[in-house]
Amino acid sequence: IVLRPSRVHNSEENTMRALTLKDILNGTFSYKTFFPNWISGQEYLHQSADNNIVLYNIETGQSYTILSNRTMKSVNASNYGLSPDRQFVYLESDYSKLWRYSYTATYYIYDLSNGEFVRGNELPRPIQYLCWSPVGSKLAYVYQNNIYLKQRPGDPPFQITFNGRENKIFNGIPDWVYEEEMLATKYALWWSPNGKFLAYAEFNDTDIPVIAYSYYGDEQYPRTINIPYPKAGAKNPVVRIFIIDTTYPAYVGPQEVPVPAMIASSDYYFSWLTWVTDERVCLQWLKRVQNVSVLSICDFREDWQTWDCPKTQEHIEESRTGWAGGFFVSTPVFSYDAISYYKIFSDKDGYKHIHYIKDTVENAIQITSGKWEAINIFRVTQDSLFYSSNEFEEYPGRRNIYRISIGSYPPSKKCVTCHLRKERCQYYTASFSDYAKYYALVCYGPGIPISTLHDGRTDQEIKILEENKELENALKNIQLPKEEIKKLEVDEITLWYKMILPPQFDRSKKYPLLIQVYGGPCSQSVRSVFAVNWISYLASKEGMVIALVDGRGTAFQGDKLLYAVYRKLGVYEVEDQITAVRKFIEMGFIDEKRIAIWGWSYGGYVSSLALASGTGLFKCGIAVAPVSSWEYYASVYTERFMGLPTKDDNLEHYKNSTVMARAEYFRNVDYLLIHGTADDNVHFQNSAQIAKALVNAQVDFQAMWYSDQNHGLSGLSTNHLYTHMTHFLKQCFSLSD
């Protein structure tokens, strides 16, 4: 018998406590990460605890305050941005959220050399987007859907576009659907590397149908929010890309970049823009039927002052088994020759890997390979390529950072993170300084997150940037649930799952089971990350077992699993959750009379369909802001996976995959339906239609709406939501309050 000190002695057990719902709602056990704001190869900015903006020099070990908290406070700044010449800082205040990424703000420019705010030719307010040029201190900004340029912060602005109009023409910023489903940014303008040119997108939403919903506010009459929002099969935005010379903007004005002929022949999207040099740019386009993507490299023609995109510099990426790319089509990372690039796409075995393209995609050289996936290319230098993958120990829910030496032949691969803090850290991201001289590693778990600084040449750890000591201490007297990540093999499908078990879990006892599901295409729920959240509380205090399962359609395990749901959303995702539940029951510790499922957004759709599957497995379930019919959701997202809702395409499955079609099947389950009335993303319409179908079928159900709340149900609504859902589940599982 080996005696070892136990963490839980009787005396200690008394001081240990379970998590409370209050802990979760107050964010008591939230963690911090440290992402340096790199400004050179060896310097970064960071906002100190007392809100000073501090510049750190790694090599000298020195630091000094570049901007005082007094200055930040004088304008109530919540964000800042240093100009590359270090002469100015913009200060952002009056933040006003719009959609997921977009917001408006007031901007003030502080002159660091003179120690005062810039006066004269002040910026208008509110501004939709503002950024410095990559060199010097030119400013580009978007105001009232038009783009403006300043050569220096105190100079008068030069207006680049004039046709901007609310909800009609968007210049330099995306419309709703491009922001949410294509660009995943608040901006649609891009400076060339040395600031000579500015590229921007123009989105024309004139013909797009409008979603309108009431915002109740406090006034006598609600106001109506109108958003041009193309639902599946509807008219889409028309996009054009322009480039302007910022040195002499009035000389020839904006020049349009031509769209590749094979793309322009039918409806299409612009998916991303990558500058290669000041006079070479790379644009990516996508057919509306999103299985063909074209990468087009364009060159500036000095003589004509135009941009030329030769057919020889067009690279086609096509998927025959699904859609192009993963969630998005990957973007290229160019090498120093300014023509060849590295890009992640599917190899012949159907795994997403890094390829090197020198001339044609057909002649691409595969850089990584195996039954795992390369996930992100962080940086390419003269001699190294840094990327992340889930290769290590064959756990798809991990992320480690690798370095491939591309300067030597044959290239050698090294895992930078695999053995650093093996138990604590299995899920990393990284942030690199210029030329990858230094980098920060941010570990998200499974242990308490930690951020560290490393030498880019030797990979040596230089210092800990943030180790969450306070959190570690706070958790010392908390009975956290146990977590395990394992896999089920079912009919040649691998189902990875995460199980969250009560602190005193005993396999011989029976526990209520809650399935938390998202399940959307190219998503991943089973990840080796740290979290103290609502489900942690349910396990810790309420004694539930919670399980998350990655079924067909989820990411980073190869195309077979990913593309299995192509054109068939709402089928296999649900089947795989049900299969997993049956396997969990077989494990012997689940009380099969007390099984619930819940999900949000796509997860709300899956949980609704699972409850209405007629299996009798689920006693109850919750759908928060669910999609109920793919005809109600955004074109860009929906059509990627479902095709078009037309008779000659996929209308039949659009109709078959609705929640409403299964209204009768909710009769024998307890269903809680929740939605925000001001959801710009998954419109309240979705839940309204579920409710209508349930009423028409005379099926009893519970519902909660959140007035004027969007898809995130934030603020006080969050507290109300989780309290309400907790009561619902405890009632369902016959747990005393």
Epitope: I66, R86, Q87, S113, N114, G115, E116, F117, V118, R119
Partner: antibody, heavy 124, light 113 residues
């Protein structure tokens, strides 16, 4: 009493460079920017540039850009102004002056204390 | 750049009399956020550096006699010496510190008549 003490008079040949120092005392050096202003015989005062001692970032009048370099040595509470490629028109009295840093967006200060001046004569 | 123009170039006033110097800027020196005028007045005696008299167009620097006053807003400003004293003989400069480059007027020489 606040003091800004400048280095002595200089005589330089055309094409040469001159470096003038400005040693400050009796105030917190990092609370003020240092500016350089010159006055050619019978001419108006002309701003050359300034520097923030907190970060060492200079700001130059475009007219002098490429010819002037302003630096600080915070440990010695001293500012320097170097003017290169001197020509006869650069003959002037060169002053340093301090200006309080404006932390608030509604602030902004004039140059409240000046050095005694340094006569730079450019002659062949 | 903001151009500062003073008038007159020189001024001869009897002791005890009022002296008025005007200064015009090529653009407004009012900052919309605080409605202040970013204009200063300096006095320079022979062989000496300039001395700050007035800032914000009308606020006297501490230690400056109250016979010196500043007024005006936007683009037109005035320095007034209500009762000229012998020690007030000097060249007076206006200066804008609204934006860079900082610029000065050409100066007004005040003498005793």
């Amino acid at each position: 009493q606040v003091q800004l003490v400048q280095s002595g008079a200089e005589v330089k040949k055309p094409g040469a460079s001159v470096k003038v120092s400005c040693k400050t005392s009796r105030y917190t050096f990092t609370e003020y920017t240092i500016h350089w202003v010159r006055q050619a015989p019978g001419q108006r005062l002309e701003w050359i540039g300034g520097i923030n001692p907190n970060n060492g970032i200079p700001n130059y009048n475009q007219k002098f850009k490429g010819r002037v370099t302003i630096t600080v040595d915070t440990s010695a509470s001293t500012a320097y102004m170097e003017l290169s490629s001197l020509r006869s028109e650069d003959t002037a009295v060169y002053y340093c002056a301090r200006r309080r840093i404006a932390y608030g967006y509604d602030e902004g200060h004039a140059m409240d204390y000046w050095g005694q001046g340094t006569l730079v004569t450019v002659s062949s | 750049d903001i151009v500062m123009t003073q008038s007159p170039d020189s001024l001869a006033v009897s002791l005890g009399e009022r002296a008025t110097i005007n200064c015009k800027s090529s653009q407004s020196l009012i900052y919309s956020r605080n409605q202040k005028n970013y204009l200063a007045w300096y006095q320079q005696k022979p062989g000496q550096p300039p001395k700050l008299l007035i800032f914000w167009a009308s606020t006297r620097e501490s230690g400056v006699p109250d016979r010196f006053s500043g007024s005006g807003f936007g683009t037109d400003f005035t320095l007034t010496i209500s009762s000229l004293q012998a020690e007030d003989v000097a060249v007076y400069y206006c200066q804008q510190y609204f934006s860079y480059p900082l610029t000065f007027g050409q100066g007004t020489k005040v003498e005793i008549k």
